[in-house]
Interface confidence: medium
């Protein structure tokens, strides 16, 4: 089928970085400056993304791939393609419509981004609090009093607290 299609459609022979130019007898023409085609057989090239304002260029546009942006210092990416930037706050804070606000008692944020989240409830796992939580750090759960027999030294780290890394794709 692919072979038949390529015989019928000359555009299928145009590689990435080119487009099938209807104005020139369907010749494969290179993408113009500031445009790209990431797949073959395209009839147009896409305009390159521009990293302006709070965005900065992480990867330059090429004839076969779009530019990638990240955010200037003091800001971090939002969204799967870093299509948005958001102001950083300090650890122990979260960004609200009124600006950066300290985490309420019983919640924490160990990053400059994201939201304040409740401390781990050690008692749900039958554990006791070994290290108290703060605005910046979750509690550390330790063994329950009944577990404190000679030789017992297990300390349970809290569930993953950090938001996963957001690297623009």
């Amino acid at each position: 089928f692919e072979r038949t299609r390529s015989l019928q459609d000359p555009c299928s022979n145009c590689p990435a970085g080119t487009f099938c130019d209807n104005n020139r007898n369907q010749i494969c023409s290179p993408c113009p400056p500031n445009s790209f085609s990431s797949a073959g057989g395209q009839r147009t090239c896409d305009i390159c993304r521009q990293c302006k304002g709070v965005f900065r260029t992480r990867k330059e546009c090429s004839s076969t791939s779009n530019a990638e942006c990240d955010c200037t210092p003091g800001f971090h990416c939002l969204g799967a393609g870093c299509s948005m930037c958001e102001q950083d706050c300090k650890q122990g804070q979260e960004l609200t419509k009124k600006g950066c606000k300290d985490c309420c008692f019983g919640t924490f944020n160990d990053q400059k981004r994201g939201i304040c989240r409740p401390w781990t409830n050690c008692s749900l796992d039958g554990k006791s609090v070994l290290v108290n939580g703060t605005k910046e750090r979750d509690v550390v759960c330790g063994p329950s009093p009944a577990d404190l027999s000679p030789g017992a030294s297990s300390v349970t780290p809290p569930a993953p607290a950090r938001e996963p890394g957001h690297s623009p794709q």
Epitope: G79, A80, E86, K97
Partner: antibody, heavy 123, light 108 residues
């Protein structure tokens, strides 16, 4: 290319069940909260459910609480919605969408959307 | 239950400015987001956090906030801007995500 593709919709009788899937590609799926949003024919958008990156936080709209279950498999880059005890008012186009970050936050926006899968509940 | 109120329709001539409002009691506290939806297509986020524009969204789209009302403004409206527009936010306690009823923008 960042992409979400929903599947699993169809015609189902009231009271029956259906499971929707959403396949993600082009981004690190496990880094983002995911949501289901629905749109009844000719109507507006309604948030249905959301799940944080690590499945540690889950939320539902009152209209589906106790009947729908959201889940995800980061190894398979997939999001799911198990819909039980379906009603006529659940008839809608169901979209999956990414949140802005990993945690489920009530002021989240919906960044990347799929094209939707249609669920029709009728006898 | 918490509601966001939008006008059902707004009409404007090409090149003019369209303004679509969204009202809700919690908007002084909660951010608003705006989506554009064309027939048969999925919604697209055009404004986030009241007034910020995602990369790739034309500069003619802007957002503003004043008290209990947020406004989406489209300057120099083009035919391709004809679509349904939805605002989205949360209630004051941060319990519910809510969409407005949508506004159909007609370009005359």
């Amino acid at each position: 290319e960042v992409q979400l593709v929903e599947s699993g919709g169809g015609l189902v009788q009231p009271g029956r069940s259906l499971r929707l899937s959403c396949a993600a590609s082009g981004f690190t799926f496990g880094d983002y909260a995911m949501h289901w949003v629905r749109q009844a024919p000719g109507k507006g958008l309604e948030w249905v459910s959301g799940i944080s990156w690590n499945s540690g936080s889950i939320g539902y709209a009152d209209s589906v609480k106790g009947r729908f279950t959201i889940s995800r498999d980061n190894a398979k880059n997939s999001l799911y919605l198990q819909m039980n005890s379906l009603r006529a008012e659940d008839t809608a186009l169901y979209y999956c969408a990414t949140g802005l970050g990993g945690w489920l936050r009530i002021d989240d926006a919906f960044d990347i959307w799929g094209q939707g899968t249609m669920v029709t509940v009728s006898s | 239950s918490y509601e966001l109120t939008q006008p059902p329709s707004v009409s404007v001539s090409p090149g003019q400015t369209a303004r679509i409002t969204c009202s809700g009691d919690a908007l002084p506290k909660q951010y608003a987001y705006w989506y554009q939806q064309k027939p048969g297509q999925a919604p697209v986020l055009v404004i986030y956090k009241d007034s910020e524009r995602p990369s790739g969204i034309p500069e003619r789209f802007s957002g503003s906030s004043s008290g209990t009302t947020v406004t989406l403004t489209i300057s120099g409206v083009q035919a391709e801007d004809e679509a349904d527009y939805y605002c989205q936010s949360a209630d004051s306690s941060g319990t519910y995500q809510v969409f407005g009823g949508g506004t159909k923008l007609t370009v005359l």
